[in-house]
Interface confidence: low
C-alpha cells in the first residue's frame, strides 16, 4: 500500500523539500515525543473483568526493536465473585502501528516501513448468538 | 540506536545501529488492513464498557485518519443492560508510531512521531479510597 501523496487541494509542495529518489522516501527516525508516557489507570490488566498478560517481542532488525503484545487470560469474563463467566467473552482490542524493518541482501541494507498489529488489551463483550433453523 | 548482528563477510563500515535518517521504500509492507475499527469489529458496541469512536484527521500525518475511543459511561453495563457504577469503564491507551511530514507539506519526507491513542475501553474494579 503506497503512502498517498497529498494533492494540491491541501497545499503546494514547498521549494524547501529535500530531493528524494523515485520510489522511496526520506525518513528521520529521531522520534517526536519520544519521552511521552502512557498514563493509564494502575494495573488495569489485572483489575479488568477481561484481564490480560503482556509479552515483549524483540527483533533487532526492527525499529523500535521492542513491541509489547497483550494476551487475554480467559475465554470468558470475571464476574463479581471472581469466577470466570463463560456466557461472556474476553476479546482482544487491537491497534495498528508503524515500524521500520531493516533487510539485509548480501552486504547491502535496505529499509522498509511495515504495519504491525498490536494487541493492546482486552474487553468483555456479550457474545453474538446466531439462531439457526 | 539498536545493535544488530552483522554478516562477518561484510565490510566493517556498516553501522550496527539504525542510522538517524533512512531512505525507505514507499510501499508499506503488511496487508491492507482495515483501519476503520467501526468496520473491523463491533466490540465498541457489545462491550460491557462500550465506547464511541472519533475520527482524528491530519493530512500532515500518515496514517492521516486515526480513530480515538472515548468510553461512553463512567460505570459498566450489567446483565440487565443498566450502568453499574460499582465498576468503572476505563480507556486502554497505546503509544503508536506515525509519520509526520517534515518539512511540513513535503510529499516524500517524514519523521517518526509517537502519539498516544485510546484504542478502546475495559471494565475494571475500582480502587476505592476511603477519605476521612
Amino acid at each position: 500500500r503506497k503512502i498517498p501523496k497529498v494533492g494540491h487541494t491541501f497545499f503546494q509542495k514547498p521549494e524547501s523539500c529535500p530531493p528524494v529518489p523515485g520510489g522511496s522516501m526520506k525518513l528521520d527516525i529521531g522520534i517526536i515525543n519520544e519521552n511521552q508516557r502512557v498514563s493509564m489507570s494502575r494495573n488495569i490488566e489485572s483489575r479488568s473483568t477481561s484481564p490480560w498478560n503482556y509479552t515483549v517481542t524483540w527483533d533487532p532488525n526492527r525499529y523500535p526493536s521492542e513491541v509489547v503484545q497483550a494476551q487475554c487470560r480467559n475465554l470468558g469474563c470475571i464476574n463479581a465473585q471472581g469466577k470466570e463467566d463463560i456466557s461472556m467473552n474476553s476479546v482482544p482490542i487491537q491497534q495498528e502501528t508503524l515500524v521500520v524493518r531493516r533487510k539485509h541482501q548480501g552486504c547491502s541494507v535496505s529499509f522498509q516501513l511495515e504495519k504491525v498489529l498490536v494487541t493492546v488489551g482486552c474487553t468483555c463483550v456479550t457474545p453474538v448468538i446466531h439462531h439457526v433453523q | 540506536g539498536i545493535t544488530i548482528p552483522r554478516n562477518p563477510g561484510c565490510p566493517n563500515s556498516e553501522d550496527k545501529n539504525f542510522p538517524r535518517t533512512v531512505m525507505v521504500n514507499l510501499n508499506i509492507h503488511n496487508r491492507n488492513t482495515n483501519t476503520n475499527p467501526k468496520r473491523s469489529s463491533d466490540y465498541y458496541n457489545r462491550s460491557t464498557s462500550p465506547w464511541n469512536l472519533h475520527r482524528n484527521e491530519d493530512p500532515e500525518r500518515y496514517p492521516s485518519v486515526i480513530w480515538e475511543a472515548k468510553c461512553r459511561h463512567l460505570g459498566c453495563i450489567n446483565a440487565d443492560g443498566n450502568v453499574d457504577y460499582h465498576m468503572n469503564s476505563v480507556p486502554i491507551q497505546q503509544e503508536i508510531l506515525v509519520l509526520r511530514r517534515e518539512p511540513p507539506h513535503c510529499p516524500n519526507s517524514f519523521r517518526l512521531e509517537k502519539i498516544l491513542v485510546s484504542v478502546g475501553c475495559t471494565c475494571v474494579t475500582p480502587i476505592v479510597h476511603h477519605v476521612a
Epitope: - | K70, C71, R72, H73, L74, S89
Partner: nanobody, 123 residues
Framework: EVQLVESGGGLVQPGGSLRLSCAAS????????VGWFRQAPGKEREFVGA????????YYAVSEKDRFTISRDNSKNTLYLQMSSLRAEDTAVYYC????????????????WGQGTLVTVSS
C-alpha cells in the same frame, strides 16, 4: 459543532424557584449528553447534573438531587434546570455543557460550553 446559550438567571429570594434554559444550535442535539455545572464566587466549577441524549438517564450531584430537576426537549434543542428551595449557597454562574460521553462531561472535560448565566439567591 454545537453552540450553547443559557438564559433564565437572575435574582431570587431564599426558598424561591427558578428555571434555567439552555438553547443549543445544531441538528445533532439528541446525540449529546448535556448537563449543568456551576461556579460560585471564589470556588471551583462543580457538577450539578446531566441527562443522556434520549433523556432516559439523568445524573444528579448527590447534594442537589432533591431540589433540582434536569430535563430536555429535543424537538426544541433545549436543556432545562428547574431549581427549587433555593439557598444563598446556590448563588453561582450556571453553565450548560455538552459532550458525546457522560464520563467526559462529568469531570468537566466536555467539548462544548455556554457562556453561563448568573443566579443570585439573596433577600
Amino acid at each position: 459543532e454545537v453552540q450553547l446559550v443559557e438564559s433564565g438567571g437572575g435574582l431570587v429570594q431564599p426558598g424561591g424557584s427558578l428555571r434555567l434554559s439552555c438553547a443549543a444550535s445544531g441538528r445533532t442535539f439528541s446525540s449529546y449528553v448535556v448537563g449543568w455545572f456551576r461556579q460560585a464566587p471564589g470556588k471551583e466549577r462543580e457538577f450539578v447534573g446531566a441527562i443522556s441524549g434520549s433523556g432516559d438517564s439523568i445524573y444528579y450531584a448527590v447534594s442537589e438531587k432533591d431540589r433540582f430537576t434536569i430535563s430536555r426537549d429535543n424537538s426544541k434543542n433545549t436543556l432545562y434546570l428547574q431549581m427549587s428551595s433555593l439557598r444563598a449557597e446556590d448563588t453561582a454562574v450556571y453553565y450548560c455543557t455538552a459532550d458525546q460521553e457522560f464520563g467526559y462531561l462529568r469531570f468537566g472535560r466536555s467539548e462544548y460550553w455556554g457562556q453561563g448565566t448568573l443566579v443570585t439567591v439573596s433577600s
